[in-house]
Interface confidence: low
């Protein structure tokens, strides 16, 4: 339904508080280097303008699109060219090209300082002194570091962030109350950002059809009692929401997400029996809860899939009549019967089914040709099952840190050209699959593990896309969204790689390592491990283990020494020499 003023429409729908928060997120996700104060100023100007349009929708400029209004506002930033370089050229373009240009300049790895957490008392004072500014700063800092963060969900995180400070700044032991909550928000936030990044990559790199297929599979697993038409409706609406958010249309996205939550709750009887609790919550919590809701129970006595999709004489007729709908029905029927499969596996099966029909429906005897199509699924199902079994056994044997190290070595040998920080970050995250998924029973392991790995490998893909260095990574990332993980799994040691020159500086450590947290110390050691493999790609597991054990002992010894710095200097030289000898460098 058309509105005279889009900005007035969204302001009224969302309310002033959410409107301002979403505009701040949008601006921070576009101009990631701008100071907080500049963004606040821009947001206030837009908000004042929106209020004039609410008062009179016919007022000057109120009929302009949100992209035009926001783009015009961003292009008033004085230091655009100095700060962003060629991004300033976007401002010479007209909509919609200008917005597309801004989107292309979003940076997944912006050169921003690490967020350092101040002392609890300092944070509580800042919270009490100016709660509004404190919370805006949170939105700003997260949005600029995560330019694809799902904006309506970030509002939910901000609400929890505020609740944590409200409760804990009054507690007897503020730190004991607050720090675990902030840690949880940080970890959940990183996971949420990465999951949304995959959705946006799916839409932007592989198109709406790919996203819709993913959504059909996931929603059919989650809502197996819902009819196909109902799932189709939800998929269409969900696709619109994510297309908007990934496209920077955050006001429309938040508004449509609220409408979708309302629709789901009004129709929960025909969607899922698990929605009752979610639907009793306030809006932000409700939407989050629905997105995370557990799978409903499968309907009893579902008939065999073979009848409609293999045995029926009408398979090719139905396929020809409406290919995507027929494949959608296949995916729906298969997914609702298999909550134990990963979404990407279900999509591989659907792709195999589609390829078979394409071939067989043109054959002399179609039925004879596609009669055994379900037999082709067996190896596709067994491959991730076996991989997860092996890796969970390895995880249980090694524990998380050493499991991460095994993956670091494995992936560095596969793609040694990738930067060390990226290899460390991605391998550490890949390694977390163990503690996240291996504890689950068999029926839940594959959806947990393989769909999580898809999210992590997408991080590798988006980071690599910014500065491509490996044809193998580019190939695995771009050829097929659902086959990324099998593609990376299948990579062997890169025999074409020329080992890196040995640089003693890379392996020189100082006393500051002793004051680092356990996590940061691990990262230092894992960085050294990656560099070792880059110097000596043919090193055996045993050789690398010996060097890493020596390294751990060296750090422990020097951190206990009276003169730590001297110890690191002298013992470090010995360690480097011993390592070179052990690895034959």
């Amino acid at each position: 339904d058309a509105h005279k003023s889009e900005v007035a429409h969204r302001f009224k729908d969302l309310g002033e508080e959410n409107f301002k928060a979403l505009v701040l997120i949008a601006f921070a996700q576009y101009l990631q280097q701008c100071p907080f104060e500049d963004h606040v100023k821009l947001v206030n100007e837009v908000t004042e303008f929106a209020k004039t349009c609410v008062a009179d929708e016919s007022a000057e400029n109120c009929d302009k699109s949100l992209h035009t209004l926001f783009g015009d506002k961003l292009c008033t930033v004085a230091t655009l060219r100095e700060t962003y370089g060629e991004m300033a050229d976007c401002c010479a373009k007209q909509e919609p090209e200008r917005n597309e240009c801004f989107l292309q300049h979003k940076d997944d790895n912006p050169n921003l300082p690490r967020l350092v957490r101040p002392e609890v008392d300092v944070m509580c004072t800042a919270f009490h002194d100016n709660e509004e500014t404190f919370l805006k700063k949170y939105l700003y800092e997260i949005a600029r570091r995560h330019p694809y963060f799902y904006a309506p969900e970030l509002l939910f995180f901000a609400k929890r962030y505020k609740a944590a400070f409200t409760e804990c700044c009054q507690a007897a032991d503020k730190a004991a109350c607050l720090l675990p909550k902030l840690d949880e928000l940080r970890d959940e936030g990183k996971a949420s950002s990465a999951k949304q990044r995959l959705k946006c990559a799916s839409l932007q790199k592989f198109g709406e059809r790919a996203f819709k297929a993913w959504a059909v599979a996931r929603l059919s697993q989650r809502f197996p009692k819902a009819e196909f038409a109902e799932v189709s409706k939800l998929v269409t609406d969900l696709t619109k929401v994510h297309t908007e958010c990934c496209h920077g249309d955050l006001l429309e996205c938040a508004d449509d997400r609220a409408d979708l939550a309302k629709y789901i709750c009004e129709n929960q009887d025909s969607i899922s029996s698990k929605l009752k609790e979610c639907c009793e919550k306030p809006l932000l919590e409700k939407s989050h809860c629905i997105a995370e809701v557990e799978n409903d129970e499968m309907p009893a006595d579902l008939p065999s899939l073979a009848a409609d999709f293999v045995e029926s004489k009408d398979v090719c007729k139905n396929y020809a009549e409406a290919k995507d709908v027929f494949l959608g029905m296949f995916l729906y029927e298969y997914a609702r019967r298999h909550p134990d499969y990963s979404v990407v596996l279900l999509l591989r099966l659907a792709k195999t089914y589609e390829t078979t029909l394409e071939k067989c429906c043109a054959a002399a005897d179609p039925h004879e040709c596609y009669a055994k199509v379900f037999d082709e699924f067996k190896p596709l199902v067994e491959e991730p099952q076996n991989l997860i079994k092996q890796n969970c056994e390895l995880f249980e044997q090694l524990g998380e840190y050493k499991f991460q190290n095994a993956l670091l070595v494995r992936y560095t040998k596969k793609v040694p050209q990738v930067s060390t920080p990226t290899l460390v970050e991605v391998s550490r995250n890949l390694g977390k699959v163990g503690s996240k998924c291996c504890k689950h029973p068999e029926a839940k392991r594959m959806p947990c593990a393989e769909d999580y790995l898809s999210v992590v490998l997408n991080q590798l893909c988006v980071l690599h896309e910014k500065t491509p260095v490996s044809d193998r990574v580019t190939k695995c990332c771009t050829e097929s969204l659902v086959n990324r993980r099998p593609c990376f799994s299948a990579l062997e040691v890169d025999e074409t790689y020329v080992p890196k020159e040995f640089n003693a500086e890379t392996f020189t450590f100082h006393a500051d390592i002793c004051t680092l947290s356990e996590k940061e110390r691990q990262i230092k050691k894992q960085t050294a491990l990656v560099e070792l493999v880059k110097h000596k790609p043919k090193a055996t597991k045993e050789q690398l283990k010996a060097v890493m054990d020596d390294f751990a002992a060296f750090v422990e010894k020097c951190c206990k020494a009276d003169d730590k710095e001297t110890c690191f200097a002298e013992e470090g030289k010995k360690l480097v020499a011993a390592s070179q000898a052990a690895l034959g460098l």
Epitope: A229, S232, T236, E321, A322, V325, M329
Partner: nanobody, 124 residues
């Protein structure tokens, strides 16, 4: 839920024509297979015609082939049944039905949603 409302029934002489309409409202979203069924007094409900969601696939009962035409306008959420060369044995209550899916459904159990029906009477 999906509501279906039929209209266009009435009294017509043998050899005459009628056009039935069925409007879907509520949660109407493609893909839906739409069907027409009829029930004469004292008889079972029987299949008349069905149309796939895109309108590309049609199917008719042998008794109405060549006389009845089913069509749909998805923009208006409406399905039509054009009935020509009507015979007294076409007298019945005509029901519109909807089912999510692809292909042609000829059995009542395949349909999830039903209208209240519209009376068609064909006199000699």
């Amino acid at each position: 839920q999906v509501q279906l409302v039929e209209s266009g029934g009435g009294l017509v002489q043998a050899g005459g024509s009628l056009r039935l309409s069925c409007v879907a409202s509520g949660r109407t979203f493609e893909p839906f297979v739409m069907g027409w069924f009829r029930q004469a007094p004292g008889k079972e409900r029987e299949f008349v015609a069905t149309i796939s969601w895109s309108g590309g696939s049609l199917s008719y009962a042998d008794s109405v082939k060549g006389r009845f035409t089913v069509s749909r306008d998805n923009a208006k959420n409406t399905v039509y049944l054009q009935m020509n060369s009507l015979k007294p044995e076409d007298t019945a209550v005509y029901y519109c039905a909807a089912a999510p899916g692809v292909g042609n459904y000829r059995y009542t159990f395949q349909y999830d949603y039903w209208g209240q029906g519209t009376q068609v009477t064909v006199s000699e």
